[in-house]
């Protein structure tokens, strides 16, 4: 029962992570203008995202412009776009794998196979979490490096946008949810001793792999 509860918690966390990841990728708030110069009166704020940039006037009016040419975009932006989309698709694939192996579905009858599918989905979610983390951390690193580079003009400097925080949250939820799904899986998929094991060793307990045997610390 506890195993089922952890599975549900794991999949809920990954779903939340996926939604966060989607919002993070879609919102044009990866980079926000950082007007630091004492002499500058801020009349507008510029938001930059993966797909568009927006200018917010002091009046509250917002104008967004979708980036025109794909080839004209910087390579790091193209890579961030690709990783974001791949991460979301990988997480969706993980969800499908999970549904096939979930306790409450009948796609797969055999317990061993169900357990393997849940474990696979957990690994897939962890991969999705890592893929989400890469563009977010890369962008944050570039923003911070610019911020402390004395030769980068103040007008060119940016601050960390809300999308980056959402991206970190998404990555954390996917890693955590995926980790939980990995941990809930018994190694043989058996809830009790198999009849083969019982025939030869009646005293042997069911071998279930505990959380500590999976290197989840590498993912979370």
């Amino acid at each position: 029962m506890a195993s089922a509860g952890m599975q549900i918690l794991g999949v809920v966390l990954t779903l939340l992570g996926w939604v966060n990841g989607l919002v993070s990728c879609a919102l044009p708030m990866w980079k926000v203008t950082a007007f630091i110069g004492n002499s500058i009166v801020v009349a507008q704020v510029v938001w930059e995202g993966l797909w568009m940039s927006c200018v917010v006037q002091s009046t509250g009016q917002m104008q967004c412009k979708v980036y025109d040419s794909l080839l004209a975009l910087p390579q790091d932006l193209q890579a961030a776009r690709a990783l974001c989309v791949i991460a979301l698709l990988v997480a969706l694939f993980g969800l499908l794998v999970y549904l096939a192996g979930a306790k409450c579905t009948t796609c797969v009858e055999e317990k061993d196979s169900k357990a393997r599918l849940v474990l696979t989905s957990g690994i897939v979610f962890v991969i999705s979490g890592v893929l989400t983390l890469i563009p977010v951390c890369w962008t944050a690193h570039a923003i911070i490096r610019d911020f402390y580079n004395p030769l980068v003009a103040e007008a060119q400097k940016r601050e960390l946008g809300a999308s980056l925080y959402l991206g970190w949250a998404a990555s954390g939820l996917l890693l955590l949810g995926g980790g939980l799904l990995c941990c809930t899986c018994p190694s043989g998929g058996s809830q009790g001793p198999s009849h083969y094991m019982a025939r030869y060793s009646t005293s042997a307990p069911a071998i279930s792999r505990g959380p500590s045997e999976y290197p989840t610390k590498n993912y979370v």
């Epitope: 500058i40 004395p150 030769l151």
Partner: antibody, heavy 119, light 107 residues
């Protein structure tokens, strides 16, 4: 109009010291990052040092670290470069440079002051 | 340290010619590259920053471009006043280094 006037250059023996000054006018001095860049007799440009607008952060290449010290007096609108343990390879025209709010890099250059290190 | 290899070291062209100076970084510097012009007897002047952005007041015949770690400064139609020495400089990380310069002359 941005004006940067360097002074303090001259002839100095190897191992000697020299202090360069840069008087700034035509802008609010304490808003801007300032730097020194030198040009060798072979016409090569070399970045020497950079200081943040408030003076709290300084940046040096390894070639001058420990020998050169940059400082600024925002009240006097003046930038300084204290040079010690001078070597023959430090012979160059030293330019005082102001950063800009809009442009990256070394935006405004002074006319330069010549430092000759020779025995 | 990041090395900036500038070529050619000198260049002679006719008025109206299209002139290109190139600069290659020894490693990735993203778009953290500036171009400077130094006219005879004068101090250098910033022309281009962030590899492609022109400083206000710089004639539109000047343009900057980037392809990976190779950067170019192009003068679409050479004018007599463009006679100068041109330098590239990266500001990706410390130490900031300059190219060796290109001396541009009129034929």
């Amino acid at each position: 109009e941005v004006k940067l006037v360097e002074s303090g250059g001259g002839l100095v023996k190897p191992g000697g010291s020299l202090r360069l000054s840069c008087a700034a006018s035509g802008f609010t001095f304490n808003y801007y990052t300032m730097s020194w860049v030198r040009q060798t007799p072979a016409k090569r440009l070399e970045w020497v040092v950079t200081i943040s607008s408030g003076g709290g952060r300084t940046y040096y290449p390894d070639s001058v670290k420990g020998r050169f010290t940059i400082s600024r007096d925002n009240a006097k609108n003046t930038l300084y470069l204290q040079m010690s343990s001078l070597r023959a390879e430090d012979t160059a025209v030293y330019y005082c440079i102001r950063g800009d709010y809009r442009y990256d890099g070394f935006a405004y250059w002074g006319q330069g002051t010549l430092v000759t290190v020779s025995s | 340290d990041i090395q900036m290899t500038q070529s050619p070291s000198s260049l002679s062209a006719s008025v109206g010619d299209r002139v290109t100076i190139t600069c290659r970084a020894s490693e990735n510097i993203d778009s953290y590259l500036a171009w400077y012009q130094q006219k005879p007897g004068k101090s250098p002047q910033l022309l281009v920053y962030a590899s492609t952005l022109l400083v206000d007041g710089v004639p539109s015949r000047f343009s900057g471009s980037r392809s990976g770690t190779q950067f170019s400064l192009t003068i679409s139609s050479l004018q007599p006043e463009d006679v100068a020495r041109y330098y590239c400089q990266h500001y990706y990380s410390i130490p900031y280094t300059f190219g060796s310069g290109t001396k541009l002359e009129i034929k």
